[in-house]
């Protein structure tokens, strides 16, 4: 009878084991072991027992002891079970950002590991077990589906293998994959709200505000604001689940035309964009042209108003005929026209909005001098010793210089309060002089003597 010891062995892959083959007869003709494993016989006294060192055991094996005794041949097997932990424990790659509400499939792949009957695959969120399954197939694959929630943000998902050899008197061997950190996000289906001027004048500044509610995590949202090809640098303020991005836009003549204003919000692997059209226009104030800004009375004056080619103008309230960017009027300058304002109003339609610009010019009419009865009476009669103020106003542009003299020497104190005396009586020659010429007028002062009764 042949026997083997031990009859069952569990050993690490690549390990060695001592196997004793024994026989019940004293003088066996033959005693040995049959195995593909490298073996080394250890010398022992006696003929009915042999000890072999079997080395580099890579896989499960069943070495067989045999003996040949007078009463016949017999065999006995020992069962070598090799254990080893998996060579690869990996979670299938996933995008790090996942939208809330999406079903996320976690897939763990396990390569190697034995004995498979003792090998379990566990999928975890943090330390919480999501799924536990025996390792089946090569590679073994275990999957589970997770409904992504907001509170999963930042959670670590991993896969662990457990090789449980405790029933065999060994320990529990664990291998864990690299963790997958989940970043969850919510980007609403509504596009961002964009507030900006619809029209903007060249060489001015405007403010653009882009905002969106219902974002998570709001601090991770990227905001891109652009006007045409110009990147805008917004100042972003964050709320609990909202942001507001404010940018100042300066436009120059280079920007004239229709530009696309875009606000793009990028969160996770998704984006939302809002597009708006901004018309940048150049509209200088209309030009009011006078033939000459200063003319003499009686001169023909042409007043022209010229504006942007697409504008419509009115000159002193009168629309251009035909309606367009130019208007003019003709007049013969009168003293009443001195200081008269000629106002040109231009209206330009830009993207459905009416823009108004005004320009005013003043006409100076040179005339005079004038001395008339109303402003310079020809006769004054005053009681002697009374207080009087002689008045004589000369008109003209430029304002004339006025002198009233009696006998070419004695002045009448125009505009001054005087005590009427006999000396004041007489005829004065009032002379008004300016660059436009000279006029004279006679003024008589009569002094009434008091009656003595």
């Amino acid at each position: 009878q042949t026997s083997v010891s031990p009859s069952k062995v569990i050993l690490p892959r690549g390990g060695s084991v001592l196997v004793t083959c024994s026989t019940s007869c004293d003088q066996p003709k033959l005693l040995g072991i049959e195995t593909p494993l490298p073996k080394k016989e250890l010398l022992l006294p006696g003929n009915n027992r042999k000890v072999y060192e079997l080395s580099n055991v890579q896989e499960d094996s069943q070495p067989m002891c045999y003996s040949n005794c007078p009463d016949g041949q017999s065999t006995a097997k020992t069962f070598l079970t090799v254990y080893w932990t998996p060579e690869r424990v990996e979670l299938a790659p996933l995008p790090s950002w996942q939208p809330v509400g999406k079903n996320l499939t976690l897939r763990c792949q396990v390569e190697g590991g034995a004995p498979r009957a003792n090998l379990t695959v566990v999928l975890l969120r943090g330390e919480k077990e999501l799924k536990r399954e025996p390792a089946v197939g090569e590679p073994a694959e275990v999957t589970t589906t997770v409904l992504v929630r907001r509170d999963h943000h930042g959670a670590n998902f991993s896969c662990r293998t457990e090789l449980d050899l405790r029933p065999q008197g060994l320990e529990l061997f664990e291998n864990t994959s690299a963790p997958y950190q989940l970043q969850t996000f919510v980007l609403p289906a509504t596009p961002p709200q964009l507030v900006s001027p619809r029209v903007l004048e060249v060489d001015t500044q405007g403010t653009v505000v882009c905002s969106l509610d219902g974002l998570f995590p709001v601090s991770e949202a990227q905001v891109h604001l652009a006007l045409g090809d110009q990147r805008l640098n917004p100042t972003v303020t964050y709320g609990n689940d909202s942001f507001s991005a404010k940018a100042s836009v300066s436009v120059t003549a280079e920007d004239e035309g229709t530009q696309r204003l875009t606000c793009a919000v990028i969160l996770g692997n998704q984006s939302q964009e809002t597009l708006q059209t901004v018309t940048i226009y150049s509209f200088p104030a209309p030009n009011v042209i006078l033939t000459k800004p200063e003319v003499s009375e009686g001169t023909e004056v042409t007043v022209k108003c010229e504006a942007h080619p697409r504008a419509k103008v009115t000159l002193n309230g009168v629309p251009a005929q035909p309606l367009g960017p130019r208007a003019q009027l003709l007049l013969k300058a009168t003293p009443e026209d001195n200081g008269r304002s000629f106002s040109c109003s231009a209206t330009l339609e830009v993207a459905g909005q009416l823009i108004h610009k005004n320009q005013t010019r003043e006409l100076r009419v040179l005339y005079g001098p004038r001395l008339d009865e109303r402003d310079c009476p020809g006769n004054w009669t005053w009681p002697e010793n009374s207080q009087q103020t002689p008045m004589c106003q000369a008109w003209g542009n430029p304002l004339p210089e006025l002198k009233c003299l009696k006998d070419g020497t004695f002045p009448l104190p125009i505009g001054e309060s005087v005590t009427v005396t006999r000396d004041l009586e007489g005829t004065y020659l009032c002379r008004a002089r300016s660059t436009q010429g000279e006029v004279t007028r006679k003024v008589t002062v009569n002094v009434l003597s008091p009656r003595y009764e």
């Epitope: 090809d229 110009q230 280079e254 004239e256 229709t258 530009q259 696309r260 875009t262 150049s282 942007h308």
Partner: antibody
């Protein structure tokens, strides 16, 4: 559809003058800025000049400033480039292109017209 | 400086992805636009703004930018994509209105 057709190119003597035209159709001409871009044979693209939709603003590359004049006639939907004091290095295909705003990218291009300056 | 720098030549195997880059100071302020020019033809706009395509341009063309570099990516290059590609931007130095890169000759290897 948008069409831009350049004309007026040809052989011109060194120091001579030439006027290029670009006839536009298929879009509101006065609402678009227009540009001239040139390409010397076998070489890259070079921006030459641009004009705003209203014609009120004009821009020139340093290499042509003082010699070339860009203009437009919105009533005729036509862009012009008056070239004078022409040099050998002005030899190129001249393309007209439109953009939604003066400094903007070029949405559409013409097929080009060749200007050859000979000595 | 008002220069935009491009690699003179790039090649790609048919169906593979290729990235053409453009560098310049103005790209920190302005987005680049990209033009395709086939031999003997006028340039055609393929990308503008941050990453916008005009109608009729296949979605294998995309644009991106970072710092002073703009990139044009062709995902799954086709034989008909063999052409010269030019980047173009507004000139932040103020000397010119717009500037072009020197161009990149793209060869599609069959």
């Amino acid at each position: 559809q948008v069409q831009l057709q350049e004309s007026g190119g040809g052989l011109v003597q060194l120091g001579g003058s030439l006027r290029l035209s670009c006839a536009a159709s298929g879009f509101t001409f006065s609402s678009y800025a227009m540009s001239w871009v040139r390409q010397a044979p076998g070489k890259g693209l070079e921006w030459v000049s641009a004009i705003s939709g209203s014609g009120g603003s004009t821009y020139y590359a340093d290499s042509v400033k003082g010699r070339f004049t860009i203009s437009r006639d919105n009533s005729k939907n036509t862009l012009y480039l008056q070239m004078s004091s022409l040099r050998a290095e002005d030899t190129a295909f001249y393309y007209c292109a439109n953009s939604a705003y003066t400094g903007g990218w070029y949405d559409y291009w013409g097929h080009g017209t060749l200007v050859t300056v000979s000595s | 400086s008002s220069e935009l720098t491009q690699d003179p030549a790039v090649s790609v195997a048919l169906g593979q992805t290729v990235k053409i880059t453009c560098q310049g100071d103005s790209l920190r302020t302005y987005y680049a636009s990209w033009y395709q020019q086939r031999p003997g033809q006028a340039p055609v706009l393929v990308i503008y703004g941050e990453n916008s395509r005009p109608s009729g341009i296949p979605d294998r063309f995309s644009g991106s930018s970072s710092g002073n570099t703009a990139s044009l990516t062709i995902t799954g290059a086709q034989a008909e994509d063999e052409a010269d590609y030019y980047c173009n931007s507004r000139d932040s130095s103020g000397n010119h209105l717009r500037v072009f890169g020197g161009g990149t000759k793209l060869t599609v290897l069959r």
